[in-house]
Structure formats: structure tokens, C-alpha cells
Interface confidence: medium
Amino acid sequence: IWSAVFLNSLFNQEVQIPLTESYCGPCPKNWICYKNNCYQFFNESKNWYESQASCMSQNASLLKVYSKEDQDLLKLVKSYHWMGLVHIPTNGSWQWEDGSILSPNLLTIIEMQKGDCALYASSFKGYIENCSIPNTYICMQRTV
Amino acid sequence: IWSAVFLNSLFNQEVQIPLTESYCGPCPKNWICYKNNCYQFFNESKNWYESQASCMSQNASLLKVYSKEDQDLLKLVKSYHWMGLVHIPTNGSWQWEDGSILSPNLLTIIEMQKGDCALYASSFKGYIENCSIPNTYICMQRTV
């Protein structure tokens, strides 16, 4: 069954683009596009503030988790990465960079360290971390 | 610094789409698009043959790893998923569904089980597995 002839015959048929196919974006060049949001994983380690600045310089923000359904690609992300979630000491809430409050049931918040910033980890977990610690980070751009 | 007002002011500026932005695809609806390839992660567990059939029914194939640079999003994939790599017992080589040979320096092949199929795991690892074992799988479509 594994002959190259057989395998080639499976894949050398001309395929019409079905009507269900569509373009995604627009996104910055070489970013990941999913459900019309743009994501990029940066593997240089920066503290939260530097990570935020890096995303901003690319007309983006640090990752905002707003929907398990629209962002289900995040389930499979390995490792820990800065996202745009910060602790507001005055009222004890967790907010995104745009000022919106973290919705319930989106992230499981885990206190790894004392801190006011959060790392995203697979399966919608948020690890509290000191904002000055260098980590990789995820930038996100909502398409216009 | 973390006041909602401050954070809002950062992100509520009108942003022009830079010329470096572009559309990705076309891809099947709700697939991930990256560097003009389309990917989808399926979390129903199927054996290799069923996984292949599922991808084919969507005008796609199981994941083919052909470039660390063009497919660097795969570095961060968590867990194990069927890809389109199969062992050809007659000559001992590993081939993709389209009959092409696995290029060196792309995957670290790890013998987890005796088998003729391979699971993709993060950081470009390929785990040998019995083709009949159910696993989640990754479909891929090269854009036209």
C-alpha cells in the first residue's frame, strides 16, 4: 500500500478550491492567522514591559484571551509566554491592556510567583509571574 | 501605571494597515493559516488510516514537515499528533504521503513503539508508532 506510485496517485489529482475556502487577515507578514486574528510567538526572552513594547511597535498588543472557541488554537501551545493580562492592585482585578476585565471561565489563574503579570500556558492557563522576569511572549493583532 | 485609562489610551488609537500586512490563504474555513499553508488540529482520536482519510475528505493531507523555517509554528505544538510520514519496509526509508523522502535535519526520529507511522511532537520530533493506535492528528493543505 505504501508504494510511491499509490501515494502519488492519491495526491496528484487536480483539486478545485471549494466555496468554503477563504482568506484570513490581513496580518503582518509571516504571522499566524486564525479566525481573522493574527498571532506571533517571539522566542527572545523579554520582561513584560519590553514584551508589550515589542508588540506595540508592530501595531499589536500582547495576547488577549477573549474566547475559548475563537482561540482554540491556544489549547495546544507549549511552554509559557507573556500575555497582556495585568493585576490592578488598587481593586484586585485582572485586566487586559485595553482595560477590559478578565472574563470568568476563560483562564485558570495559577499563582506561580508573587507578581502583577501573567504568562499564558497551554489549555487556557494563566500563571502569575513577576513582571520583571524575562519570558518569551505572544503578540496578537485583531484584524481591522 | 495599570489604570484602565492609561491602557485604553495606548490601544484606542486609529491604526493604518501597514503595507507589510497581507492576507493568508485561501484555507478551509476556520483553519490556521501560516506562511500560506493551512493547518488544522483535530482532537478526535483516530488511527493513522482514518486520520489520513479524514484529511483527504477535506482536500488536505496529513501534516508534511518540509521546512523548519516555513513551519516554525510547529515548534510550539503540545502533545502528539499523527502526521503523514510512513515507513517503507522494502527500502527502510521514511516517506511522506506524496511519495517524497523525509529530508535530513527536519525531524528527530524517536522509536517510541515498533511501527510504520509517525506522530509529530513539539520541536520537530517524530515518534514512531503503530499505525493502528488512535491519536489526534494534524491536517495540512498547501495553498494553491
Epitope: - | K68, E69, N91, G92, S93, W94, S100, I101, L102, S103, P104, N105, L106, L107, T108, I109
Partner: antibody, heavy 123, light 107 residues
């Protein structure tokens, strides 16, 4: 003991095609564990990887030469070949055919080399 | 393309000396780095790859270390037959690239 031997003209005129052949002895060129490679060395550019070929014919080329280079394999003669089109003086170099050390689908350097053949591009 | 920068490009040493050559990659290449020795009129000879693994038949006075972007070749006690040019090569991604070489000469 695997041995490689380059052959071909030592002098090529500008704008012509450089053609070299590498004959493999002591092993089969179609062994599934072997890839084959061309590398050149010039005083100006040092060592430069030209490209690789697998016994099945699949290739990888240096992007800087891709538009001018063809590497092919002839399993019946146990040979692989290099053609470099539209040569200039900058292509003057010692050309080596070689075999990369390949283990578990990873390249670990080039462990068998031909003795090299000097090609001069001049009218 | 990944650039490899050797240091120094020229080295003058005596028999018995400990010699260290460095190769810096323009981006991370894990441990996919090879070291070669070349004598005049001869093809390069593979000494070490990946990064720290000595090839069979290579004397134990040669050793390699490093990962990512910084790599080192060390000859613990230089012998007369070690006077040659040493090259590094990255095999992390195509196109494969080589450093310009470090020439080790007799002082």
C-alpha cells in the same frame, strides 16, 4: 571503504557550462542512508556548499547558485554530476564531491570527500 | 543565510601549546556545528560533529564545546601534524555555510 573521484575539464570558458562527474566506489550510490553533496573552495569565497542530492533524485541547492545549478544522479553508473551554467571567473575554484555523515535523519558534517578538482574559468 | 565568524583568523603557536578557536553563528544553530581540519592541497577532514562529538580516529587532544551561537574547538597539546587550517560549518539549515577558517601556524 567508500571513495569518491571527481572528473571533468579543468578549463571552462566564460558563459559556458561547467560539468563535473563524481564516481562512487566501495558502496552503492542508491543506498537509502546516503546523500551526496558538491562543495567548492576558492581563495575569495572560502568553502561554499553548492547542493545535495539523494539517490531518489531529490535535491537541495544553495539559493545563491540555484538558478544556474543542476545536480543529478545516475544509479546505473554509480555516479552523480554537477552542471553549473553561465560560468564567470568567480566560479574558478576547487570542486569537491562528498558524502555527508547522516544518522537518524540528521546531517552531522561531511565525512567522505573526493580529492577535489581544480576548475579555472578563463577564455 | 547563517553567517559563521571564526576567531582568530590566524594563530601562531608552539608544539605543546593549548589552542582555542572560536566560531560564532549569526543565529542559534542548536548543536549542529562541525569542525574540519584542512592541510594544503588536501580535502577537509571532519574532526568533530555535532559540536562536541569526536569522530572516530580523531585524537583525543581535540575537543569541541558550545551550543546555540558560540562554539569552541580546543587542541589541548598542539602536535606538529596539527598545523593546518580549521573550519567550522553549520548544518542547522540550508544553505549550509562555512566559516572562513583559522590558520594555525608554527611560532
Amino acid at each position: 571503504q567508500l571513495q569518491l573521484q571527481e572528473s571533468g575539464p579543468g578549463l571552462v570558458k566564460p558563459s559556458e557550462t561547467l560539468s563535473l562527474t563524481c564516481t562512487v566506489s566501495g558502496g552503492s550510490i542508491s543506498s537509502s542512508s546516503y546523500y551526496w553533496v558538491w562543495i567548492r573552495q576558492s581563495p575569495g569565497k572560502g568553502l561554499e556548499w553548492i547542493g545535495n542530492i539523494y539517490s531518489s533524485g531529490s535535491t537541495h541547492y544553495n539559493p545563491s547558485l540555484k538558478s544556474r545549478v543542476i545536480i543529478s544522479v545516475d544509479t546505473s553508473k554509480n555516479q552523480f554530476s554537477l552542471k553549473l551554467k553561465s560560468v564567470t571567473a568567480a566560479d574558478t575554484a576547487v570542486y569537491y564531491c562528498a558524502k555527508p555523515l547522516l544518522r537518524d535523519y540528521y546531517y552531522y558534517g561531511v565525512d567522505v570527500w573526493g580529492q577535489g578538482t581544480t576548475v579555472t574559468v578563463s577564455s | 543565510d547563517i553567517q559563521l565568524t571564526p576567531s582568530p583568523s590566524f594563530l601562531s603557536a608552539s608544539v605543546g601549546d593549548r589552542v582555542t578557536i572560536t566560531c560564532r553563528a549569526s543565529q542559534a544553530i542548536s548543536s549542529y556545528l562541525a569542525w574540519y581540519q584542512q592541510k594544503p592541497g588536501k580535502a577537509p577532514k571532519l574532526l568533530i560533529s555535532p559540536a562536541s562529538t569526536l569522530q572516530s580516529g580523531v585524537p583525543s587532544r581535540f575537543s569541541g564545546s558550545g551550543s546555540g551561537t558560540e562554539f569552541t574547538l580546543t587542541i589541548s597539546s598542539l602536535q606538529p601534524e596539527d598545523f593546518a587550517t580549521y573550519f567550522c560549518q553549520q548544518l542547522n539549515s540550508f544553505p549550509w555555510t562555512f566559516g572562513q577558517g583559522t590558520k594555525v601556524e608554527i611560532k
